[in-house]
Interface confidence: low
C-alpha cells in the first residue's frame, strides 16, 4: 500500500478520505487505526456502527469520528481540533471477522496554524512542490477545509 | 543548508538545515533533492514535535536517516553508503502559511 499524507492545521478539523471498492467490502464494518512503529500493531481508534446498515451514522471517540458511505464506497474520519500529538501514520480498515483489511495507509501531518504570520525568515522562499515515489499528500489548510492536491508524491 | 561536499562512493554526509522565524516543532520538515536534468523528488520527511514518524523514498531507504532538534531548530539528513546516484543539490522543505518553502540547497556529488 502507498501511503497517502494528509495535512491539517493544529487546532482545526481534519478530514480523511478512504475510497475503497463498495462491492468487494459488501457489508463489512470499518475503522481507523494508529500504527505503533512501522512494524507494530495499529492500534483501534474508532469504528463504524455495529450495525452495517447503520454505518452512515456518525461515531465518535474523543475528539475523532467516523463514518461510512457504504454506496459510494467513502469511509470518512474526521479529527477534531487537531494537535500536534495526533501525527503520525494511521490506517482505514475493512473488517471482516476476527481479520482487517488495509483500505489506505495514511500519514497525517499537524502544520501550526497559518494565522501565526510572523516572517518565516531568510531562510525560506515559497516554490511549487514536486514529485516524490512513494506517497501523495491532500493538503486541508483553511478553516473551511479546501481541499487542494499536491504531487508530494504520487501515488503508482 | 549546509554539510554538502564531494564524497567518495561508499562514503558518509550529514546535511544540517536551520529554520526560524515559526514555531518549529509545530512543523513537518521534508529534505528534496534535485539532480541534474531531473525533477525534485522527495527523500525524507520527518513529524512534528518528537519527531517520531519517518517516511523515506525507497531509494535511500536503511541509508538515510533523518532526524530533527526542536531545542535548536535544526533538521538533519545523515547520508551514508551514497552512491553515485545520490549525487543533486539537496533542499529542506516545510510547508508554512499553507505553501511549500525551500531552503537555498547544498550541493552533495559522489564520485571517485
Known amino acids: 500500500h502507498n501511503t497517502t499524507v494528509f495535512q491539517g492545521v493544529a487546532g482545526q478539523s481534519l478530514q480523511v478520505s478512504c475510497p475503497y471498492d463498495s462491492m468487494k467490502h459488501w457489508g463489512r464494518r470499518k475503522a481507523w487505526c494508529r500504527q505503533l512503529g512501522e512494524k507494530g500493531p495499529c492500534q483501534r481508534v474508532v469504528s463504524t456502527h455495529n450495525l452495517w446498515l447503520l454505518s452512515f451514522l456518525r461515531r465518535w471517540n474523543g475528539s475523532t469520528a467516523i463514518t461510512d458511505d457504504t454506496l459510494g464506497g467513502t469511509l470518512t474520519i474526521t479529527l477534531r481540533n487537531l494537535q500536534p500529538h495526533d501525527a503520525g501514520l494511521y490506517q482505514c480498515q475493512s473488517l471482516h471477522g476476527s481479520e482487517a483489511d488495509t483500505l489506505r495507509k495514511v500519514l497525517v501531518e499537524v502544520l501550526a496554524d497559518p494565522l501565526d504570520h510572523r516572517d518565516a525568515g531568510d531562510l525560506w522562499f515559497p516554490g511549487e512542490s514536486e514529485s516524490f515515489e512513494d506517497a501523495h499528500v491532500e493538503h486541508s489548510i483553511s478553516r473551511s477545509l479546501l481541499e487542494g492536491e499536491i504531487p508530494f508524491p504520487p501515488t503508482s | 543548508e549546509s554539510g554538502g561536499g564531494l564524497v567518495q562512493p561508499g562514503g558518509s554526509l550529514r546535511l544540517s538545515c536551520a529554520a526560524s522565524?515559526?514555531?518549529?516543532?509545530?512543523?513537518?520538515m521534508h529534505w528534496y533533492r534535485q539532480a541534474p536534468e531531473k525533477e525534485r523528488e522527495l527523500v525524507a520527511l520527518?513529524?512534528?514535535?518528537?519527531?517520531?514518524?519517518?517516511n523515506y523514498a525507497g531509494s535511500v531507504k536503511g541509508r538515510f536517516t533523518i532526524s530533527r532538534d526542536n531545542t535548536k531548530n535544526m533538521v538533519y539528513l545523515q547520508m551514508n553508503n551514497l552512491k553515485p546516484e545520490d549525487t543533486a543539490v539537496y533542499y529542506c522543505?516545510?510547508?508554512?502559511?499553507?505553501?511549500?518553502?525551500w531552503g537555498q540547497g547544498t550541493q552533495v556529488t559522489v564520485s571517485s
Open positions: 522543505n516545510v510547508v508554512y502559511n499553507g505553501r511549500p518553502n
Open positions: 522565524g515559526f514555531a518549529f516543532s509545530n512543523y513537518v
Open positions: 520527518i513529524g512534528s514535535q518528537g519527531g517520531a514518524y519517518t
